[in-house]
């Protein structure tokens, strides 16, 4: 009689198999030990209860063991990201066992059927792990499940069903549809492994979110806010990749999670850092660049184990391609206005000058509006390491370069038609580097001239390390 599998009864009954394979008695899930860096190599298929392939293929019982779990597939073939990830794991962890979980027959179906098959696939992985645990020297602590999209939830089921606790699960943009808001036992969740880290790259608050929006791990990282990934816009993909449709833009953004993880493996010397924040808007304002009390972490493979009482949402900006690392800066600008200027929306740009390099001209994104006679916080980021910052050029864009700016200026004029001399005063800019956590204060180069108006610029030079000035009380740093 069939064995009852797990807490919810007989899993085999749940298999949603295509008609073509309903009569097959072969297992629907295969485990391929990738024994070579050569992506074309057929590898070694492991078979539950058969120890010979483990020996023949050189399975290392004491080494780390990675299980790569693919997601839903429209084509029924392994996608190109797979061998990139396999190769990166082999490069980084030379002695590790890299196992590809092949559940293509069960994933190459209607999405709803593939979702319904995740539980049985998770159980197959759990049974393989239970069998491996019977071997001397094999430890679940050394097991790292890496699941992409639907595969992330498969990893969750595997972690849930296995006897004991796996060391780590990494969810690479876990699938959203049919999992968003689901009970913790029906999706990836923090209790599925000792450490669950998640990268979210395709979340949408409008329309269909291919990736899950809710946090599902111990740490949940949302690169670029978890939605629009640089290099994945329609213009980018038409030119640079075999992508030419909205579908391919979606694929580019969804798959970005895999590439960020690969980047963390192969560009160990260029780690990307994420910062804890309550939401994306606060991060965009530059409020959340603190590393105090585990508020920042490396992303991907290099993430430090953090087991918080509650989910930790973390954010970062990235480049459009590998290496993805950028350098984050918080800029605090105290804006004085000596005239009643009404509502004003300046378009500010900064250029940062450092000991290693100078930045490009960077826009200061105004998330809400500029507060007058108050400190405004901004986030800027550079693709290159500037070294120690020396000076800053602040520019207020003059003649409108877009319809949006023209509209802003017209609206500003309509609200204050008799105030043609729009002017703000800025004496100091405080800068904090996210990567180094170093704080610097920059003072207006000419203390007599701190005013800025459209089409004009101001220069600021470093005037001290840290943020406190003479005769100044300690500023209250907003923490996430």
């Amino acid at each position: 009689s069939p064995t009852p599998f797990g807490p919810e009864g007989q899993l085999e009954d749940e298999l949603h198999k295509p008609k073509a394979i309903q009569t097959e008695v072969k297992p629907s899930v295969r485990f391929n030990l990738r024994t070579s860096k050569d992506p074309e190599h057929e590898g070694c298929y492991l078979s539950l209860g058969h120890s010979q392939p483990l020996e023949d293929c050189g399975f290392n019982m004491t080494a780390k063991t990675f299980f790569i779990i693919h997601g839903w597939t429209m084509s029924g073939i392994f996608e190109n990201w797979l061998h990139k990830l396999v190769s990166a794991l082999h490069t980084r962890e030379k002695d590790a066992n890299v196992v590809v979980v092949d559940w293509l027959p069960l994933a190459h179906q209607l999405y709803t059927d593939a979702v319904n098959n995740t539980r049985v696939v998770g159980h197959s992985i759990a049974r393989m792990l239970d069998w491996l645990q019977e071997k001397d020297d094999f430890s679940l602590e050394n097991v790292h499940l890496i699941g992409y999209s639907l595969g992330a939830h498969v990893a969750g089921y595997a972690g849930n069903f296995v006897k004991g606790t796996v060391g780590r699960i990494t969810g690479l943009d876990p699938a959203g549809p049919m999992f968003e808001g689901a009970d913790i036992h029906k999706r990836l969740s923090p209790d599925d492994a000792d450490f669950v880290d998640v990268l979210h790259t395709y979340t949408r608050s409008f329309g269909l979110s291919i990736g899950i929006q809710m946090p599902v791990g111990h740490i949940d990282i949302y690169p670029n806010g978890g939605d629009f990934q640089p290099g994945c816009g329609l213009n980018d993909v038409l030119g640079s990749m075999a992508y030419g449709t909205i579908t391919e833009v979606v694929k580019c953004e969804h798959e970005r999670a895999v590439h960020l993880f690969v980047d963390s493996l192969v560009n160990q010397d260029k780690p990307s850092f994420a910062f804890q924040c309550t939401d994306s808007n606060r991060f965009k304002k530059g409020i959340c660049l603190s590393c105090r009390k585990n508020r920042c972490n490396s992303i991907g493979y290099n993430a430090k184990k953090m087991r918080n009482k509650r989910n930790s949402k973390m954010y970062l900006k990235t480049r459009a391609g590998m290496p993805f690392r950028v350098y984050h800066y918080q800029m605090k600008i105290h804006v004085f206005s000596y005239k009643n200027m009404g509502e004003i929306e300046p378009t500010f740009y900064v250029t940062l000058y450092g000991t290693n390099a100078d930045s490009q001209t960077l826009p200061l994104e105004i998330v809400e509006r500029i507060e007058q006679n108050a400190t405004n916080t901004f986030l800027v980021y550079t693709e290159e390491d500037l070294g120690d910052l020396l000076k800053i050029q602040l520019t207020w864009e003059g003649a409108s370069q877009s319809w949006y700016n023209l509209w802003k200026e017209l609206r500003s004029y309509l609200s204050q038609p008799h105030n043609p001399g729009r002017e703000l005063n800025i004496r100091r800019i405080r800068v904090k580097s996210g990567e180094t956590q170093r704080k610097l204060t920059f003072c207006a180069e000419d203390p007599e001239n701190t005013s800025i108006s459209p089409g004009r610029e101001l220069w600021f030079r470093k005037c001290r390390d840290g943020w406190r000035m003479k005769n100044e009380t300690s500023p209250t740093v907003e923490l996430p």
């Epitope: 394979i21 992506p39 190599h41 057929e42 190109n80």
Partner: antibody, heavy 120, light 112 residues
Framework: QIQLVQSGPELKKPGETVKISCKAS????????MNWVKQAPGKGLKWMGW????????TYTDDFKGRFAFSLETSASTAFLQINNLKNEDTATYFC?????????????WGQGTTLTVSS | DIVLTQSPASLAVSLGQRATISCKAS??????????MHWYQQKPGQPPKLLIY???NLESGIPARFSGSGSGTDFTLNIHPVEEEDAATYYC??????????FGGGTKLEIK
């Protein structure tokens, strides 16, 4: 050594059915996918689709959906191409070719080809 | 679908000279630094034979006079020096991610 050996030439009438075989040897049959490629007389190569030799799930390109069927006899390491309701335009040489499930999916070994002539 | 356009459709090259065949894709066939473009040789009455995979990698057993280059949408197969036995039709093929995978129209090489 690795070999793909196909069945011999076929002469058929329109409306009939043909089944072409491709027997693999020298490697583990279920560890590689099997493609089918059509080449009409004096023309180029046209990919018809492939079959997962482990699960038996076939995938057809748009031009070969309907009358065409890929199947397997795993125990004999053999893949089959069946064409129903034959038409004159099915006259061609059909090749099987294997590819690795992993990596870059190029076709590294090919069968010698089976010539199908459809004529009334 | 990605369309591959080969040129020229045919060419005649003297023994010992260089033959250059071009293959242009309607969109990029690159993926994260790899090009999913392959080249095959087919002689009359024979099946195609893999020469070059992933744009520039020589398949084992293929003479070094065959070489491939290119990335993105533009690829080239070079044969130098051309030998008598190289008379054949050459096809490019792309296998970038989701099928359908496609072949170019072919280039017939004649030896003068």
């Amino acid at each position: 050594q690795i070999q793909l050996v196909q069945s011999g030439p076929e002469l058929k009438k329109p409306g009939e059915t043909v089944k072409i075989s491709c027997k693999a040897s020298g490697y583990t049959f279920t560890n590689y996918g099997m493609n089918w490629v059509k080449q009409a007389p004096g023309k180029g190569l046209k990919w018809m689709g492939w079959i997962n030799t482990y699960s038996g799930v076939p995938t057809y390109t748009d031009d070969f959906k309907g009358r065409f069927a890929f199947s397997l006899e795993t125990s004999a390491s053999t893949a089959f191409l069946q064409i129903n309701n034959l038409k004159n335009e099915d006259t061609a040489t059909y090749f099987c070719a294997r590819f690795s499930y992993y990596g870059r999916h190029y076709f590294d070994y090919w069968g010698q080809g089976t010539t199908l002539t459809v004529s009334s | 679908d990605i369309v591959l356009t080969q040129s020229p459709a045919s060419l005649a090259v003297s023994l010992g000279q260089r033959a250059t065949i071009s293959c242009k894709a309607s969109q990029s066939v690159d993926y994260d630094g790899d090009s999913y473009m392959h080249w095959y040789q087919q002689k009359p009455g024979q099946p195609p034979k893999l020469l070059i995979y992933a744009a520039s990698n020589l398949e084992s057993g293929i003479p070094a006079r065959f070489s491939g280059s290119g990335s993105g949408t533009d690829f080239t197969l070079n044969i130098h020096p051309v030998e008598e036995e190289d008379a054949a039709t050459y096809y490019c093929q792309q296998t970038n991610d989701d099928p359908p995978w496609t072949f170019g129209g072919g280039t017939k090489l004649e030896i003068k």
